[in-house]
């Protein structure tokens, strides 16, 4: 069967430019190695925001310079994207790949529309 991936339709980033959402997948097999990728779709262009490979039961580790952090629990991944600005508003797609053992399975979520509103600058106070 195809691997189903669920993620929320809409998320509002915090005033500090942080957005969190859960990406949940229904695994058709007993994977030990899983790769999670966050993609951003703007118009018809798809770009990779961040990616992490983890072993089931271990923590999810993104690269040190990544704007993403995350934790995993079973077939659920809690993703946080930091440093977002208004121009980063868009559709963020969660992609899950069961890398090992074979067979490989792919699951792509419908995407989470993340809205980012730049904070108003604080007025000068006398």
């Amino acid at each position: 069967k195809a691997m189903h991936v669920a993620q929320p339709a809409v998320v509002l980033a915090s005033s500090r430019g942080i957005a969190s959402f859960v990406c949940e997948y229904a695994s058709p097999g007993k994977a030990t190695e899983v790769r999670v990728t966050v993609l951003r779709q703007a118009d018809s262009q798809v770009t990779e925001v961040c990616a992490a490979t983890y072993m089931m039961g271990n923590e999810l580790t993104f690269l040190d310079d990544s704007i993403c952090t995350g934790t995993s629990s079973g077939n659920q991944v809690n993703l946080t994207i930091q440093g977002l600005r208004a121009m980063d508003t868009g559709l963020y797609i969660c992609k899950v790949e069961l890398m090992y053992p074979p067979p490989y399975y792919l699951g792509i979520g419908n995407g989470t529309q993340i809205y980012v509103i730049d904070p108003e600058p604080c007025p000068d106070s006398d």
């Epitope: 195809a2 691997m3 058709p28 190695e33 798809v46 770009t47 890398m99 490989y104 792919l106 792509i108």
Partner: antibody
Framework: QVQLVESGGGVVQPGRSLRLSCAAS????????MHWVRQAPGKGLEWVAV????????YYADSVKGRFTISRDNSKNTLYLQMYSLRAEDTAVYYC?????????????WGQGTLVTVSS | EIVLTQSPGTLSLSPGDRATLSCRAS???????LAWYQQKPGQAPRLLIY???SRATGIPDRFSGSGSGTDFTLTISRLEPEDFAVYYC?????????SGPGTKVDIK
């Protein structure tokens, strides 16, 4: 622009070995899964093997498992296919193809192909 | 392994005609993870459609894809002379990545 150039094809006797290469340019090679796909004369497309981004994960079609080895050198932007114990049914044009960003199993760019003929 | 069946094997049409190509999967493991490719004689295949219905970069809008689960369709709304070729469907939802046998669209 994305370019994939295969080399190494030729005529080889059954049971012998051959190594194909695919030189990639125009994109960040280490960020993409890479495939070999073959096409026997007058036939359809047959996926042969894939190697993932970092080279740690590899998958093969049953027809070549144990005989072919896919590898990559990210420092040289080159993909390889080492073929052992070649059979007549391995005769085909071998294409190197890039996996897509959205899904590694989408072949979004292809090389021009290199012909491998296995014959005595 | 997911087996893909394409029909018809050959489609004989004239320029300006509408072409409807079918691809059926043996199981729903492909979901919407289906791509279509065009191949002309002596050339490498070219990606047309992915995700069952999304056009690849630079593909004219006369090409459209539809379907999900096990039944998929590639439609060419008005055939141009350069569209006469062989078309393959391919699933990428699970390994091994499998392709259909192809549909040849030739000039009547």
């Amino acid at each position: 622009q994305v370019q994939l150039v295969e080399s190494g094809g030729g005529v080889v006797q059954p049971g012998r070995s051959l190594r194909l290469s695919c030189a990639a340019s125009g994109f960040t090679f280490s960020s993409y899964g890479m495939h070999w796909v073959r096409q026997a004369p007058g036939k359809g497309l047959e996926w042969v093997a894939v190697i993932w981004y970092d080279g740690n994960n590899k998958y093969y079609a049953d027809s070549v498992k144990g005989r072919f080895t896919i590898s990559r050198d990210n420092s040289k932007n080159t993909l390889y296919l080492q073929m052992y114990s070649l059979r007549a049914e391995d005769t085909a044009v071998y294409y190197c193809a890039r996996g897509g960003i959205l899904a590694a199993g989408i072949f979004d760019y292809w090389g021009q192909g290199t012909l491998v003929t296995v014959s005595s | 392994e997911i087996v893909l069946t394409q029909s018809p094997g050959t489609l004989s049409l004239s320029p300006g005609d509408r072409a409807t190509l079918s691809c059926r999967a043996s199981q729903s493991g492909s979901s919407s993870y289906l791509a279509w490719y065009q191949q002309k004689p002596g050339q490498a295949p070219r990606l047309l459609i992915y995700g069952a219905s999304s056009r690849a970069t630079g593909i004219p809008d006369r090409f459209s894809g539809s379907g999900s689960g096990t039944d998929f369709t590639l439609t060419i709304s008005r055939l141009e002379p350069e569209d006469f070729a062989v078309y393959y469907c391919q699933q990428y939802g699970t390994s091994p990545f499998t392709s259909g046998p192809g549909t040849k669209v030739d000039i009547k």
